[in-house]
């Protein structure tokens, strides 16, 4: 029975005489008068078994002590740690020539664990052991026993086990403890790869190459390898494993992403919070589920927020010219959180007086620049039929519109072709400019082509470049545009509408608001 003693993690003990409770029972030769088993107290007052011999008076001593059979356990090199005391020959009277201060250490490999006798010629000498510290009579009186520790190694071993032997040639020795161990590189995890307990190589310079296995929920990036050195230390880690999608490294293991987190790929990244408008309800998510009404396009990365279709375009304006129509609109108020917005035009030919009787316009109608996938907010439609009612729908679409198409994403206008619209207005004037307003006036078109029902003023900040414009409608030939920003350049266009539709816009009039009121007359080109 052996008690537990704590040794380094990279040492595996095969024999520890201090852990044996009861007699060791090793074989001595001669059976009497040589090595003798004696029980002593250690520093913690625990009884330990020792072997002692002190035949220093008699010449030609040859006392052998052999351990029981020691299993090799696959080790190719073992280490022998001997703790012993040795009497100083100079402190013993009348022993000159017979007293020695060394002993010899031997081993013998054998597959037989029950050899009963010591055959000296079978044993191979490991080394002669000398004491670094010997003790004298004075030391005994003071109870100071100087303990020596010597370690020797032997290998390569190949048989199932071996015996150790100690040869005394006339010294005064006490073997306090004998420990036999081999070294291993202990089980470890590096770079998410687990490397097993590995016994060191046969010689003191050998390196044992070991392939690691990826920990749970991880996969190889490069083949993980390490080398087990002779001293039981792992060296030179090569390669690594990466946590699978839905998992992250935490304290050397791959743990599932928490609820509300995700990881899309096998990388060394940590899990990330679900992007806006998405969630995960289970641990280990590789992507997050979009909130209701939100979607992810096929080519959207898992890291992108979930988005929704855009709202309808704004401020749709139509301009009929006989059998052609120009349409113009503003971007939707809500783009759904995406940049990939475009516009589709739907043309419907409708029966007079019954808007429900509409059918597609067919392939004879032409669109410039195109009918679908428009990136600009303008389109010209030509080759329409004369004297016909048409309804045009402008649909705002983005990368997720196909998942939830809705009429809320379109705006429509109905026009009648083949009636001449009014000509454009030739002269627009700025009558008064203040900090916050511009008073405009204009002439009737040269060719009204009917009764002018109203005028439409379109204006925008110059540096906004028509991206965000406003519309004001009036029946008079003048209007005050209020609510402007001071010291800001604005561009104004005016057009007339008759029953036939809108005419073309006038040339732009550029006006900069003032810091103080002033009365000026513009000429339709530029005014400051």
């Amino acid at each position: 029975v052996t008690g537990s003693r704590v040794y380094p993690a990279n040492e595996v003990t095969l024999l520890d005489s201090r852990s044996v409770q009861g007699e060791l029972g090793w074989i001595a030769s001669p059976l009497e008068g040589g090595w003798e088993e004696v029980s002593i107290m250690d520093e913690k007052n625990t009884p330990i078994r020792t072997y002692q011999v002190c035949n220093v008076m008699e010449p030609s001593q040859n006392n052998w002590l052999r351990t029981d059979w020691i299993t090799r356990e696959g080790a190719q090199r073992v280490y022998i740690e001997i703790k012993f005391t040795l009497r100083d020959c100079n402190s013993l009277p009348g022993v000159m020539g017979t007293c020695k201060e060394t002993f010899n250490l031997y081993y013998y490999e054998s597959d037989n664990d029950k050899e009963r006798f010591i055959r000296e010629n079978q044993f191979v000498k490991i080394d002669t052991i000398a004491a670094d510290e010997s003790f004298t009579q004075v030391d005994i009186g003071d109870r100071i026993m100087k303990l020596n520790t010597e370690i020797r190694d032997v290998g390569p071993l190949s048989k199932k086990g071996f015996y150790l032997a100690f040869q005394d040639v006339g010294a005064c020795i006490a073997l306090v403890s004998v420990r036999v161990f081999y070294k291993k590189c202990p089980l470890t995890v590096r770079n998410l790869a687990q490397f097993p307990d590995t016994i060191t190589g046969a010689d003191t310079s050998s390196l044992v190459e070991v392939r690691g296995s990826c920990v749970n929920n991880s996969e190889e990036k490069d083949v993980p390898k390490m080398y087990c050195g002779a001293d039981g230390e792992w060296l030179v880690p090569i390669g690594n494993c990466l946590c699978n999608a839905g998992h992250e490294e935490r304290s050397g293991e791959c743990q599932a992403c928490k609820i509300g987190y995700y990881k899309a790929l096998s990388t060394d990244a940590t899990c990330a919070k679900c992007p806006p408008h998405s969630y995960s309800v289970w641990e280990g998510a590789t992507s997050c589920t979009c909130d209701r009404g939100f979607f992810r396009a096929d080519n959207d990365a898992a890291s992108m927020p979930c988005t929704r279709p855009p709202s309808a375009p704004l401020n749709l304006i139509s301009n009929v010219n006989e059998t052609s129509v120009n349409l113009e609109w503003s971007s939707p108020q809500n783009t759904g959180g995406r940049q990939d917005i475009s516009y589709n035009v739907v043309c419907k030919k409708c029966g007079a007086g019954d808007p429900s009787k509409c059918r597609p316009c067919g392939s004879g109608v032409h669109y410039t620049p195109q009918q679908n996938g428009l990136k600009t907010t303008k389109v010209s439609i030509t080759d329409l039929l004369a004297h016909t009612n048409y309804t045009f729908e402008i649909w705002a679409v983005n990368g997720v519109s196909k998942y939830n198409p809705s009429p809320d994403q379109s705006v429509s206008v109905t026009v009648t072709t083949n009636q001449a619209a009014p000509s454009s207005i030739a002269l627009v004037q700025a009558k008064e400019v203040t900090r916050y307003s511009v008073a405009l006036a204009w002439l009737e078109p040269d060719r009204p082509n009917g009764v002018i029902l109203e005028y439409e003023v379109k204006y925008y900040e110059k540096d906004q470049n028509e991206r965000s414009y406003r519309i004001v409608r009036t029946a008079a030939r003048n209007t005050d545009i209020k609510g402007l920003n001071p010291l800001t350049s604005y561009v104004f266009h005016v057009r007339a509408r008759t029953a036939a539709g809108y005419g073309d816009f006038s040339e732009p009039l550029e006006v900069t608001t003032n810091t103080v009121p002033s009365r000026i007359i513009g000429d339709g080109a530029n005014s400051t």
Epitope: N216, R250, S251, E253, Q255, K258, I259, G260, T270, A272, K273, E283
Partner: antibody, heavy 115, light 109 residues
């Protein structure tokens, strides 16, 4: 769902002491569990964690001084060689499954180390 | 290991008032937002108030508000009540380690 610590008492320096946290209403196979301590009149100090896999991780200052282990319904904290500086109330706490932090705490158990 | 610093060890305000508690991390917390706030009263375990920097824990009044990201975080308590007198701790997570701030005592006058 609740946690309760036990095992706190007066010990002499160097005498190992094991505290136990008993869980009810949830499974230790589903949650990571931490130990936190608080010296009298002082702030909170995180000691370490035992993951649901059974692996452990300790704060740098706590390595070698504490050992965390678990059974199916309890989590133990062993103070390997207590010193007077280890006098504190010891809390066990459950790590949330939805954020990095503790969402359930026990009431604590007092350990006094004195010669 | 990351260090969390709560600059004020004590703050005070009158009932109905507002207090702000700061927590500064020596390095960005995990995901820039894995920071929680706890309230602790004498003889009791800590109570979770805020998680992931700004999410209100279940049953916690909306008077408690967490904000911040990366290394700078704030807990704001408005409409202060007598029951809010306690010590408040921030807790951050980074690279396997949890770290508590030193704590800030709130005194309600």
């Amino acid at each position: 769902q609740s946690l309760e610590e036990s095992g706190g008492r007066l010990v002499t320096p160097g005498t190992p002491l094991t505290l136990t946290c008993t869980v009810s209403g949830f499974s230790l196979s589903s949650y990571h569990m931490s130990w936190v301590r608080q010296a009298p009149g002082k702030g909170l100090e995180w000691i370490g964690i035992i993951y649901r896999s059974g692996n452990t991780y300790y704060a740098n200052w706590a390595k070698g001084r504490f050992t965390i282990s678990k059974t199916s319904t309890t989590v133990d904290l062993k103070i390997t060689s207590p010193t007077t500086e280890d006098t504190a109330t010891y809390f066990c706490a459950r790590e949330s499954s939805t954020f990095y932090g503790m969402d359930l705490w026990g009431p604590g158990t007092l350990v006094t180390v004195s010669s | 290991d990351p260090v969390l610093t709560q600059t004020a060890s004590s703050v005070s305000a009158a009932v109905g008032g507002t207090v702000t508690i700061n927590c500064q991390a020596s390095q960005s917390v995990y995901g820039n937002n894995e920071l929680a706030w706890y309230q602790q009263k004498p003889g009791q375990p800590p109570k979770l108030l805020i998680y992931t920097a700004s999410s209100l824990a279940s049953g916690v009044p909306s008077r408690f508000k967490g904000s911040g990201s990366g290394t700078e975080f704030t807990l704001t308590i408005s409409d202060l009540e007598c029951a809010d007198a306690a010590t408040y701790y921030c807790l951050g997570y980074k690279s396997d380690d949890y770290t508590f701030g030193g704590g800030t005592e709130v005194v309600v006058k």
